[in-house]
């Protein structure tokens, strides 16, 4: 994989000397252009040969509050003629991503990030034929 | 292009808290001292017939540092006998994604909320016709 | 009006390099692919190059692999094909073509075609 | 490499009489396959696309027809704007656009 480096003087955010309490602007920032993040066809879920449905995941203590997941239509994939190949599989594809979580009972607000692992798509992969030991 | 996004509503007005200063809340960012990164399960990268590779990022002033990005391997998928289907697609599936930027100003502690488009895998599909007006 | 103009050809020496534009108007360009076709004089067609609407699939024919480069700005409603090391075979009419694929992606089947450029590679 | 062969070379008819051009794929490329015109000093235009579905703006003259490797593009009775090049394209395998050489519709 290729890496592409960003050097700076600042500490890195990861490091271990790094402070464990942050102050954090609610406002979000959208790096991407308007334009980007409208161009992703929302039909990928129907045409794909591993589609696959999006559920509405909900907590109000929790931001992003809605996160949607993906979970596959079919065991196996769908093949040029509409119909299941048994020698592919469908597979979710899930990402690591980023959620800030309110602590309980908490003025001033406090916050805690946590790691949340979420269905984002499916994909077709041939079947692994295990051998027999 | 940066565009600024409403803020977090929901979590702002929960409890009997007084309203946010400056939409300003503390963060603990514990989570990421053991563990760099975001991790991404990488199984199927190379078994799926939409195959793709990881370029990873990396930014000191973000929240996680490290992020690894999908890029589709080919145009078209890979058939049951190892050549391009042309007739298919290999497209990415983009998931909106939550890290923390560090205010512009210097070393300081304080970050913003940024959205990025992250390409997550790549799944196959089945092109259509452009409808033209 | 909806249209692909190219511009950028003419007579080059062997070994030499070329690039090639392709400006379209009338039509939203990333919402498609694009592609460069090329015709040699009194000869049939011939595909070189395509790039879909973000650059993320680019593909191009055995003939021209590692010599000629396709991009795209969408911002600036253009496509460009840079090509180095010219042959002499490589003297052609160069055409823009609009991909017929929905969302950017490829369809591989031309519905748009601009007039062309002509290269001609000689010494 | 898929190598589509059209046939014949050249085709001599008069206005008004039915064409019948042939367009032979090397190996099968399925439905996969497009027609295209081309006149003298112009580009090519797109007539029938996937074997049988005729393009935007293209007369019901023009059908086409055929899969596996065998096709054929058919102008039901031919005016005068139709005498031109035509080329059979395949998008099945990689490469993805191959053409045939071209079938020439001559003025008899």
């Known amino acids: 994989a290729a890496i592409i480096p960003q050097s700076s003087a600042c500490p890195n955010t990861e490091a271990k000397d790094f402070l464990q309490n942050v102050k954090v602007n609610l406002k979000v920032f959208n790096s991407l252009g308007a334009k980007v993040s409208s161009r992703r066809p929302s039909d990928y879920l129907n045409r794909s040969t591993s589609p696959w449905t999006l559920h509405r995941n909900e907590d109000p203590d929790r931001y992003p509050s809605v996160i949607w997941e993906a979970q596959c239509r079919h065991q196996r994939c769908v093949n040029a003629e509409g119909k299941l190949d048994h020698h592919m599989n469908s597979v979710l594809i899930q990402q690591e991503i980023l959620v800030l979580k309110r602590e309980p009972e908490s003025c001033p607000f406090t916050f805690r990030v946590e790691k949340m692992l979420v269905g984002v798509g499916c994909t077709c992969v041939a079947s692994i034929v295990r051998q027999a030991a | 292009r940066k565009n600024p996004k409403a803020g977090v509503p929901a979590l702002q007005k929960a409890g009997n808290c007084p309203p946010l200063e400056d939409n300003t809340v503390r963060v603990d960012i514990r989570i990421f001292n053991q563990n760099q990164g975001i991790s991404v399960p990488r199984e199927f990268q190379n078994r799926s017939s939409s195959p793709w590779d990881y370029n990873i990022t990396r930014d000191p002033h973000r929240f996680p540092s490290e992020i690894a990005e999908a890029q589709c391997r080919h145009s078209g998928c890979i058939n049951a006998q190892g050549q391009e289907d042309s007739t298919m697609n290999s497209v990415a599936i983009q998931q909106e994604i939550l890290v923390l930027r560090r205010e512009p100003q210097g070393c300081s502690n304080s970050f913003r909320l940024e959205k990025m488009l992250l390409k997550v895998g790549c799944t196959c599909v089945k092109p259509i016709v452009h409808q033209a007006a | 009006e909806v249209q692909l103009v190219e511009s950028g050809g003419g007579l080059v020496q062997p070994g030499r390099s070329l690039r090639l534009s392709c400006a379209a108007s009338?039509?939203?360009?990333?919402?498609?692919?694009m592609h460069w076709v090329r015709q040699a004089p009194g000869k049939g067609l011939e595909w070189v190059s395509g790039?879909?609407?973000?650059?993320?699939?680019?593909g191009y024919a055995d003939s021209v692999k590692g010599r000629f480069t396709i991009s795209r700005d969408n911002a600036k409603n253009s496509l460009y094909l840079q090509m180095n090391s010219l042959r002499a075979e490589d003297t052609a009419l160069y055409y823009c073509?609009?991909?017929?694929?929905?969302?950017?992606?490829?369809?591989?089947?031309?519905?748009?075609w601009g007039r062309g450029t002509l290269v001609t590679v000689s010494s | 490499e898929i190598v589509l062969t059209q046939s014949p070379a050249t085709l001599s008819l008069s206005p008004g009489e039915r064409a019948t051009l042939s367009c032979r794929a090397s190996?099968?490329?399925?439905?996969?396959l497009a027609w295209y015109q081309q006149k003298p000093g112009q580009a090519p235009r797109l007539l029938i696309y996937d074997a049988s579905n005729r393009a935007t703006g293209i007369p019901a003259r023009f059908s086409g027809s055929g899969s596996g490797t065998d096709f054929t593009l058919t102008i039901s009775s031919l005016e005068p704007e139709d005498f031109a090049v035509y080329y059979c394209q395949q998008r099945s395998n990689w490469p993805p656009a191959t053409f045939g050489g071209g079938t020439k519709v001559e003025i008899k």
């Open positions: 073509a609009r991909d017929m694929g929905g969302f950017g992606e490829f369809y591989w089947n031309f519905g748009l």
């Open positions: 009338g039509f939203t360009f990333d919402d498609y692919a």
């Open positions: 190996q099968s490329v399925r439905s996969y």
């Open positions: 790039i879909n609407w973000n650059s993320g699939g680019i």
